[in-house]
């Protein structure tokens, strides 16, 4: 017989990502004896909560908490029983709840209270349900991407930790109700609200971040729908042959479409709207989402928001990935350059509903929105953020890194559980358990 060293015990953490359109649960794990190492935390499992985001339960807060039960029950199975009590559980809500908090703070509080009540019933170490600021959402997404890609520090073969010279990656997140851009910058921000100073593993990072509320995919689609109703009476971004009944109350209930809301409208009225497969009119409609008329700083992205020039490589995730992946995979179109991305958007916008359905079978009506989505992504990156062909060459569209979803959830947990120390790690001896 010989002594066999047991693998180290694992620790777990749970984050509920309460997005505007749906909630996802992520369970993370890491070896208990390597808590301060980098790149050591990975995704153990995930679960998609059925139904809409928690903000859609404004009139039924208990429904929000009830919707989480299936995934929480899965968490009881996925995390070993003896680890339940020591497993931190967080819920972070993003732009959907930020919007609800703007229009109906009481409903927003009620939803969070109902959710909190349910989460405390479980044997995990519940550490709160709260609404993240746009800045937090952006920064935690940036932390996640760079942590997973080991851009902060690495463990060298000589037994020392060192900072890789490749620098950090910028992060771009396109959610349902907001979009975030975050990247490391050398010069101080002209707008202090857009700058975050981070100390990670003994290194100092100056990070630019901005979150654009109402510029998430779903809200953009609603705004385009409102514009189409207002100016055309048809939808240039929808495919010809596609038509649907639009409930005006659904279109104008969001604060994002408030500016387009007619003075007197019947919220229960339905309007029939048809697509026209018109890429040029669609481009014009999307252009109307961005304002470049005034900039109180030396330079801006759009809507008078300060932004330094984009620098370095970027990872674009969530709906950025899904949109570009649809063009690349489902439509078989090249998207390696900005020019190709624009051509791909035009290609999709030229398709009739019959052509689109035949190319991409078995899809829900959401298929009709890929033209607008592609046109928006192309314009946001090129005109909005100012990516030129050279800079766009450094953008990778990714859903996962190291088998872990890229998004704010991991960065949030790493921060709240102090899994990324501010101080540099000391010299460590590794133990091989293989």
């Amino acid at each position: 017989t010989r002594d066999v060293r047991e693998p180290p015990a694992l620790k777990y953490g749970i984050v509920l990502d309460a997005g505007s359109s749906h909630t996802s649960m992520f369970i993370y794990k890491w070896p208990a004896d390597k808590e301060n190492d980098t790149g050591i935390v990975g995704q153990h499992s995930s679960c998609d909560v059925p139904g809409g985001g928690i903000s859609s339960y404004a009139d039924n807060p208990s429904g929000a908490s009830q919707s989480l039960v299936g995934c929480l029950e899965q968490a009881l199975q996925d995390v070993p029983k003896e680890r339940h009590a020591g497993t931190p559980l967080y819920l972070g809500a993003t732009a959907g709840m930020r919007l609800l908090n703007l229009t109906n703070p009481e409903a927003s509080t009620s939803v969070l209270m109902a959710v909190t009540h349910t989460l405390t019933q479980y044997p995990f170490d519940f550490r709160g349900a709260r609404i993240l600021s746009g800045q937090e959402e952006g920064v935690f997404g940036w932390v996640t991407a760079n942590y997973l890609l080991e851009n902060f520090i690495k463990y060298g073969w000589v037994g020392r930790w060192f900072r890789p010279r490749k620098g950090t990656l910028g992060a771009m997140d396109l959610g349902g109700a907001s979009t975030q851009i975050t990247f490391e910058t050398t010069s101080p921000a002209e707008d202090r609200a857009s700058e975050v100073q981070l100390h990670l593993y003994g290194q100092h990072y100056r990070v630019y971040t901005h979150s654009f509320l109402c510029y998430g995919r779903d809200q953009v689609l609603q705004r385009l729908l409102a514009s189409a109703l207002q100016t055309h009476g048809f939808h240039p971004c929808w495919p010809r042959g596609f038509s649907t009944q639009v409930l005006l109350g659904d279109v104008y209930q969001s604060p994002c479409t408030m500016a387009q809301r007619p003075q007197n409208f019947n919220s229960s009225a339905r309007v029939s709207l048809s697509g026209s497969s018109d890429p040029h009119l669609c481009r014009d409609l999307v252009s109307g989402l961005f304002s470049f008329s005034s900039c109180p700083f030396s330079r801006c992205s759009f809507n008078g928001v300060f932004q330094p020039p984009v620098a370095g490589n970027f990872v674009a995730f969530s709906a950025f990935f899904y949109t570009v992946d649809f063009l690349r995979t489902s439509m078989g179109l090249p998207v390696a350059t900005l020019q190709q991305l624009e051509a791909a958007a035009v290609n999709v916008c030229n398709q009739t509903w019959a052509q689109l359905q035949a190319r991409v079978p078995g899809q829900r009506a959401r298929l009709a929105d890929y033209c607008a989505g592609a046109m928006f992504v192309q314009q946001l990156l090129s005109r909005g953020y100012g990516f030129d062909e050279r800079a766009f060459g450094g953008v990778i569209f990714q859903k996962k890194a190291a088998d872990t979803a890229v998004g704010w959830a991991l960065g949030y947990m790493l921060n709240l559980t102090n899994l990324i120390p501010a101080d540099p790690p000391g010299l460590r001896k590794g133990t091989d358990f293989s």
Epitope: T329, S330, Q357, R359, V360, P361, Q363, R364
Partner: antibody, heavy 120, light 108 residues
């Protein structure tokens, strides 16, 4: 009433190719697509690829990429599936299935299939 | 890559209700299709778009889909319902149709 009629059973040697045809009788390929699905003995269904003849659009499952070619002749309303570099694991019943716009391009009409046996 | 998981077999007493599940990540966001295949025959579409029946399919067949699970329900099961049942969905990420492994339904 559209029916699909496939070519007859084939016995092939490893390394060779097979080309199976599928003719739509009583209708055309206008607005339809055709998928090829295979089923090894005692196994489940496996999608190989599809063609939208009126768009000239083809898609293949990654597993068969480079080994399968799907074509269609609109004038005769016939679709073809050619599988090359055959190996014993390719022994299966090969079905062609019509994808209909009325069913969101899922498979609403199937033929009885063509048995392809790969044996040395 | 996207996978659909079905139980290998399901048994139901004659006249009772059979439920066959099909699980996959966020399958509720996709449309699910169900096919019935009897020995030596080609598959037949019994449910499309989650819960719709093609003409000629009895009302006893119904479907549902939400979250991570789609379900085919066969009420008042008959001996003639004995067959293999496959769920299918289109995987947008890889531009391909995906079939579940199939479930053998036995009517006792």
């Amino acid at each position: 009433q559209v029916q699909l009629v496939q070519s007859g059973a084939e016995v092939k040697k490893p390394g060779s190719s097979v080309k199976v045809s599928c003719k739509a009788s009583g209708g055309t390929f206008d607005s339809y697509a055709v998928s090829w699905v295979r089923q090894a003995p005692g196994q489940g269904l496996e999608w190989m690829g599809r063609i939208v003849p009126w768009l000239g659009h083809t898609q293949y499952a990654q597993k068969f990429q480079g080994r399968v070619t799907i074509t269609a002749d609109e004038s005769t309303s016939t679709a073809y599936m050619e599988l090359s570099s055959l190996r014993s694991e390719d022994t299966a019943v090969y079905y062609c299935a019509r994808e209909s716009p009325g069913y969101r391009y899922s498979f609403d009409v199937w033929d009885q299939g063509t048995l392809v046996t790969v044996s040395s | 890559s996207y996978e659909l998981t079905q139980p290998l077999s399901v048994s139901v007493a004659l006249g009772q209700t059979a439920r066959i599940t099909c699980s996959g990540d966020a399958i509720g966001e996709k449309y699910v299709y169900w096919y019935q295949q009897k020995p030596g025959q080609a598959p037949v579409l019994v449910i499309y778009d989650d819960n719709n029946r093609p003409s000629g399919i009895p009302e006893r067949f119904s479907g549902s889909n939400s979250g991570n699970t789609a379900t085919l329900t066969i009420s008042r099961a008959q001996a003639g319902d004995e067959a293999d049942y496959y769920c299918a969905s289109y995987d947008l990420q890889q531009a391909r149709w995906v079939f579940g492994g199939g479930t053998k339904l036995t009517v006792l």
